[in-house]
């Protein structure tokens, strides 16, 4: 596959990996970061400007919603 994913190809890849639950272009605030002041990393930075793998793409999927309690 390509070394980098940009534009429509990046969107297709995210939709394929995340399914219909959707995705973020930036990780939610505080996602995987111990510092509140850490700059937000985006999927374009990680996968378009640099190469990335499937697991990296998965980090940008929207979280699963819990089942509604009875």
């Amino acid at each position: 596959g390509p070394e980098t994913l940009c534009g429509a190809e990046l969107v297709d890849a995210l939709q394929f990996v995340c399914g219909d639950r959707g995705f973020y272009f930036n990780k939610p605030t505080g996602y995987g970061s111990s510092s509140r002041r850490a700059p937000q990393t985006g999927i374009v930075d990680e996968c378009c400007f640099r190469s990335c793998d499937l697991r990296r793409l998965e980090m940008y999927c929207a979280p699963l919603k819990p089942a509604k309690s009875a």
């Epitope: 596959g1 297709d12 394929f16 219909d20 639950r21």
Partner: antibody, heavy 120, light 107 residues
Framework: QVQLQQSGAEVKKPGSSVKVSCKAS????????ISWVRQAPGQGLEWMGG????????NYAQKFQGRVTITADESTSTAYMELSSLRSEDTAVYYC?????????????WGQGTLVTVSS | DIQMTQSPSSLSASVGDRVTIACRAS??????LNWYQQKPGKAPKLLIY???SLQSGVSSRFSGSGSGTEFTLTISSLQPEDFATYFC?????????FGQGTRLEIK
């Protein structure tokens, strides 16, 4: 009209591998995700994984991770599913399937199925 | 993984009957639920996508409803060609998962 034509039935020994092909015709191949779904005799449907040929990105169900490899050859519009370390429980009909959009999992096109029998 | 549970697992009905099949997801999947029909020796056929949208070419006697975790497939007036096995499928999050199937038989 999109058609997915699969390779013929296979009989394999436990521990061996099988590679099933799925040739697409009648539409764009590269930008559509192809998934593989299997069905053991009298059982339900089980998604194994899929690939977007143009991106070369494959996504696998955890159950099959490390044992299945899904690839695609854009020049022949053919997707492949290889399953290794076969056991009797892998006896099933294996289908390739495709959705209406590049990434979709709404499978509106299916291959005819390939019966793989694992027996000593 | 999201588990999909169908009920009943089998069902006997007569031509002309109204039939309902239920599908429950182990987690909220919004409306990302499909229904398939499968006849012996054949590949599944997509009937309903996104919980309630009728696939092109499918008879309007098939309808789907529901959201969140509870979904239903309804066949308004059974025809002889409707006797088959029906599966639900979630597309909300890979791995894509299917219900175990509901076998619809002639009474």
């Amino acid at each position: 009209q999109v058609q997915l034509q699969q390779s013929g039935a296979e009989v394999k020994k436990p521990g061996s591998s099988v590679k099933v092909s799925c040739k697409a015709s009648g539409g764009t191949f590269s930008s559509y995700a192809i998934s593989w779904v299997r069905q053991a005799p009298g059982q339900g449907l089980e998604w194994m994984g899929g690939i977007i040929p143009i991106l070369g990105i494959a996504n696998y169900a955890q159950k099959f991770q490390g044992r299945v490899t899904i690839t695609a050859d854009e020049s022949t519009s053919t997707a492949y599913m290889e399953l290794s370390s076969l056991r009797s429980e892998d006896t099933a009909v294996y289908y390739c399937a495709r959705g209406p959009r590049g990434y979709s999992y709404n499978f509106d096109y299916w291959g005819q199925g390939t019966l793989v029998t694992v027996s000593s | 993984d999201i588990q999909m549970t169908q009920s009943p697992s089998s069902l006997s009905a007569s031509v002309g009957d109204r039939v309902t099949i239920a599908c429950r997801a182990s987690q909220t999947i919004s409306r990302y639920l499909n229904w398939y029909q499968q006849k012996p020796g054949k590949a599944p056929k997509l009937l309903i996508y996104a919980a309630s949208s009728l696939q092109s070419g499918v008879s309007s006697r098939f309808s789907g409803s529901g959201s969140g975790t509870e979904f239903t497939l309804t066949i308004s007036s059974l025809q002889p060609e409707d006797f088959a096995t029906y599966f639900c499928q979630q597309t909300y999050s890979p791995p894509i998962t299917f219900g175990q199937g509901t076998r619809l038989e002639i009474k």
